[in-house]
Amino acid sequence: MMTGTIETTGNISAEKGGSIILQCHLSSTTAQVTQVNWEQQDQLLAICNADLGWHISPSFKDRVAPGPGLGLTLQSLTVNDTGEYFCIYHTYPDGTYTGRIFLEVLESSVAEHGARFQIPTGDYKDDDDKPNKGSGTTS
């Protein structure tokens, strides 16, 4: 049974040419996080895998940076970056949890960069920002 919930930074805005951090946090479940996908509409931006660490899609390598934590940093923003972003948590045994963030990239300097919450850095093991492996092998 899926008991977890995903908190996200919600609706956010940023200035053209600037950068923004997209963050999600999965709570209320003991499920093992095996992978987190970041997607923009149906385009894959990045993956953070428990075994492999981060993989950034080649077409976004210049403008996407992993972290902090399981979050994603978008750089050199353009107006075309406006839209929906999804964090997709693959977990065992619960299954897939999805969080939604809407980003608006503004021409002017009235963008607010504040996020609703800070992800606690202690939530994730390992220095290389891999998802928590939980108890390891499951059988």
Epitope: N49, D51, L52, T137
Partner: antibody, heavy 119, light 107 residues
Framework: EVQLVESGGGLVQPGGSLRLSCAAS????????MHWVRQAPGKGLEWVAF????????YYADTVKGRFTISRDNAKNSLYLQMNSLRAEDTAVYYC????????????WGQGTMVTVSS | DIQMTQSPSSLSASVGDRVTITCRAS??????LAWYQQKPGKAPKLLIY???TLQSGVPSRFSGSGSGTDFTLTISSLQPEDFATYYC?????????FGGGTKVEIK
């Protein structure tokens, strides 16, 4: 070109054991999770087991849990399925399949190896 | 476990026909459904994943739609090489489960 080649199938008596192998080539094996899926004669597909790229996550179908063991050797680009306490209902073609990088869908499959459990 | 129910179990169609196969999950699987094609004596081939994303190299006459519990595979204009058995698979949660298959035969 991605290639997956299974071997090790054959005829075995009930209660016996077999070890299946899957040799991978044409891609960076150590980056991908791998599945075993089986298909009984004239029947549909049944997922059997999964192992993540670095072996930290291993899952089994309830029908094989405690009897089958999935493992991999990334240095040898090989996937294995150790099958013990075999039953007649384990008779099937066994396929190894690669998991997509992003989802648990299976994007490349081997040609399969037949396992027959009969006395 | 999530049960996947495909319909119909078989159908007869002609080259050029529009063919629709449905798959229903026993509970919501969001968009996480894959479709496979299997020909006799051959391994399955991935056509579509995440409900509607076409696997690289798959002809555009194949399309997928749906979310939640109800999904559809459509072949817009059936070709001779499309006569095969089609399976759906949920990749939302463990254990990953398949539908029973739909055999597409020549009318």
């Amino acid at each position: 070109e991605v290639q997956l080649v299974e071997s090790g199938g054959g005829l075995v008596q009930p209660g016996g054991s077999l070890r299946l192998s899957c040799a991978a080539s044409g891609f960076t094996f150590s980056n991908f999770g791998m599945h075993w899926v089986r298909q009984a004669p004239g029947k549909g597909l049944e997922w059997v087991a999964f192992i993540s790229s670095g072996s930290s996550s291993i899952y089994y179908a309830d029908t094989v849990k405690g009897r089958f063991t999935i493992s991999r050797d990334n240095a040898k680009n090989s996937l294995y399925l150790q099958m013990n306490s075999l039953r007649a209902e384990d008779t099937a073609v066994y396929y190894c399949a690669r998991m997509r990088l992003d989802y648990y869908a299976m994007d490349y499959w081997g040609q399969g190896t037949m396992v027959t459990v009969s006395s | 476990d999530i049960q996947m129910t495909q319909s119909p179990s078989s159908l007869s169609a002609s080259v050029g026909d529009r063919v629709t196969i449905t798959c229903r999950a026993s509970k919501s699987i969001s968009k996480y459904l894959a479709w496979y094609q299997q020909k006799p004596g051959k391994a399955p081939k991935l056509l579509i994943y995440s409900g509607s994303t076409l696997q690289s190299g798959v002809p555009s006459r194949f399309s997928g739609s749906g979310s939640g519990t109800d999904f559809t595979l459509t072949i817009s204009s059936l070709q001779p090489e499309d006569f095969a058995t089609y399976y759906c698979q949920q990749h939302n949660e463990y254990p990953w489960t398949f539908g029973g298959g739909t055999k597409v035969e020549i009318k």
